[in-house]
Amino acid sequence: GSQHIRAEKAMVDGSWLDLAKRSKLEAQPFAHLTINATDIPSGSHKVSLSSWYHDRGWAKISNMTFSNGKLIVNQDGFYYLYANICFRHHETSGDLATEYLQLMVYVTKTSIKIPSSHTLMKGGSTKYWSGNSEFHFYSINVGGFFKLRSGEEISIEVSNPSLLDPDQDATYFGAFKVRDID
Amino acid sequence: GSQHIRAEKAMVDGSWLDLAKRSKLEAQPFAHLTINATDIPSGSHKVSLSSWYHDRGWAKISNMTFSNGKLIVNQDGFYYLYANICFRHHETSGDLATEYLQLMVYVTKTSIKIPSSHTLMKGGSTKYWSGNSEFHFYSINVGGFFKLRSGEEISIEVSNPSLLDPDQDATYFGAFKVRDID
Amino acid sequence: GSQHIRAEKAMVDGSWLDLAKRSKLEAQPFAHLTINATDIPSGSHKVSLSSWYHDRGWAKISNMTFSNGKLIVNQDGFYYLYANICFRHHETSGDLATEYLQLMVYVTKTSIKIPSSHTLMKGGSTKYWSGNSEFHFYSINVGGFFKLRSGEEISIEVSNPSLLDPDQDATYFGAFKVRDID
């Protein structure tokens, strides 16, 4: 009798642990990646940013992978994605090639199965940064809720990468899982 | 036998309640604080904004504390932090001291244990607000995912506080807990 | 005895399923709606945007309803709301009526019970888009955490709708439920 009861209890505990594992013990994936300023490309054309920190300062990652400049999804789900990109220029760092700038960010998703890239979010502004002004600054923020599958990759493209603000509080992107796919 | 079964069940229920308490019954902390326009500092220099509403209109707080102009974390966890800051000027309110402005926001974290302040997020823009234009407006939005410990404090610093838009839909910041720390 | 044990287990399972249903099986509501460019109003005045996709490309909806240009809440809760609005103009598409623009977004909540509309979030900028420049672009992002009741409706108002960028990665808004109301 007692043995049978324990078996029943194990079944209940099994169900409970299954839920617990899914909803609590298997931690929800997240990442907050900050720009690695030692390797920012030069130029004014649109480029993919491949150097990000994932384990220093505010940067962190869990149940996702950072590889080859891309944030890789390890767990299917609906995620909130965000990016904050700051551009700046001070006259002491040199001249601007042009005073008319297109300062843009593109958050893209790449599927390995179907090797194609799609833009999930974009933001930015055209700016007139006069050569007569000592300092210029501009920030872009984008965010949105997206279905991501395991193996898909998130990357960041920007125009005018040489103007990026290298501070960890300025130029970063991230994701956190909000819920499972039904 | 029946008593033994109830004891077994109580153990199962205890485990279940423990999960439920952690994941549901212990409500996840959040805050959405809106600017208190009756006490906005003047001037153009960078200042910490200390007057915010937490219990009127859209403003609300739960399982966090608002004290001395700072949002205090009561529960360890990973939080999504955000801020929306609007600046505006109408010629009927007087002249601008300068037409060249740096309109910025800094979301900072202070630890009481180690009394130091660190900027988590920043955003903004340099702007030319010509005296020939009747009205000027500009908004900044920042957001990011951060590990916060109980006792840590979140505060907002801005430049040109006298230009802040005092509406509750314009100038606000907030946080909500997404998950526990492993 | 065995029958009694099963009844006890059913009670435990009932409690467990109740939690599971609330926290996992009853999927958390969300929506990500992208602009329907086939029906963007013209003009420069402030208008409510009523045409959005909810089931193509990045657009999706679950446990919320999209009707008559409004996102309808079906489940009480605290939601994170966001919007990203992009404006653009290329000289090949004609002249601007004025070079001085107010590019704004307003995220509004309407209660059917009390037929009144309130702005939850606003953002934007005054811009000078010179006729001498070939291309202009500007994006706004807003986000915040709000208590929403079943039956309440979320809508988007913008100024200068004719300048909206019709791409799905550019102009969108959304919501996801974070937690229940205590």
Epitope: G43, E91, T92, D95, A97, T98, N132 | Y128 | -
Partner: antibody
């Protein structure tokens, strides 16, 4: 330290062209406009134009627009200024120059004397 | 083009005395809260040397007896106590807008 070293003196026939060089060192060549200024004998200084070496953006004063071409070779950090259809009044010292870290022309080449004579 | 007119064209100052050179622009050279006027010294056979940038800022290594003032269209270079080595031609220059332009120069002679 920032250095601008120019090519040697030139004696050229009227109607011909001249191409002067300016080798830069001590700074990132692709992040500053490199300017060309000339000084005719006994006369003042005259700004001719400039190049931003990275993308090769140029700007010229109207007076020289049709006759001057400024180029740059980023691999050697060298800028060039070619002046066509030379006249006797083009006889001058030609300087390449760069602004300081704030403003004003803080760095000058040693100058190249160009003499236009038959 | 912005025309810069310097005066006087030449001046003679005794050692230890003050020298003042004026530069007038045909239109304002101010923008973004700054005056884009600079002063140079040139000695025979040499390239010009930057003395003052942005109307009133002393370039590194330049003696403190040199100073600049002014805004919008009227600017002044002052040498508080002239020394023998100050004999040279002085030019003003604006770079507020293209094309950048120079004044005609002022030749300083030491008595």
């Amino acid at each position: 330290q920032v250095q601008l070293v120019q090519s040697g003196a030139e004696l050229v026939q009227p109607g011909a062209s001249v191409k002067l060089s300016c080798k830069a060192s001590g700074y990132t060549f692709t992040t500053y406009w490199l300017q060309w200024v000339r000084q005719t004998p006994g006369q003042g200084l005259e700004w001719m134009g400039a190049i931003y070496p990275g993308p090769g953006n140029t700007k010229y004063t109207q007076k020289f627009k049709d006759r001057v071409t400024i180029t740059a070779d980023t691999s050697t950090s060298t800028a060039y200024m070619q002046l066509n259809s030379l006249r006797s009044e083009d006889s001058a010292v030609y300087y390449c120059a760069r602004r300081g870290s704030r403003r004003g022309i803080a760095y000058w080449g040693q100058g190249t004397l160009v003499t236009v004579s038959a | 083009n912005i025309v810069l007119t310097q005066s006087p064209a030449s001046l003679s100052v005794s050692l230890g005395q003050r020298a003042t050179i004026s530069c007038r622009a045909s239109e304002s050279v101010d923008s973004y809260g700054r005056s884009f006027m600079h002063w140079y010294q040139q000695k025979p056979g040499q390239a010009p040397k930057l003395l003052i940038y942005l109307a009133s800022n002393l370039e590194s290594g330049v003696p403190s007896r040199f100073s600049g003032s002014g805004s919008r269209t009227d600017f002044t270079l002052t040498i508080s106590r002239v020394e023998a080595e100050d004999a040279a031609t002085y030019y003003c220059q604006q770079d507020n807008e293209d094309p950048y332009t120079f004044g005609g120069g002022t030749k300083l002679e030491i008595k």
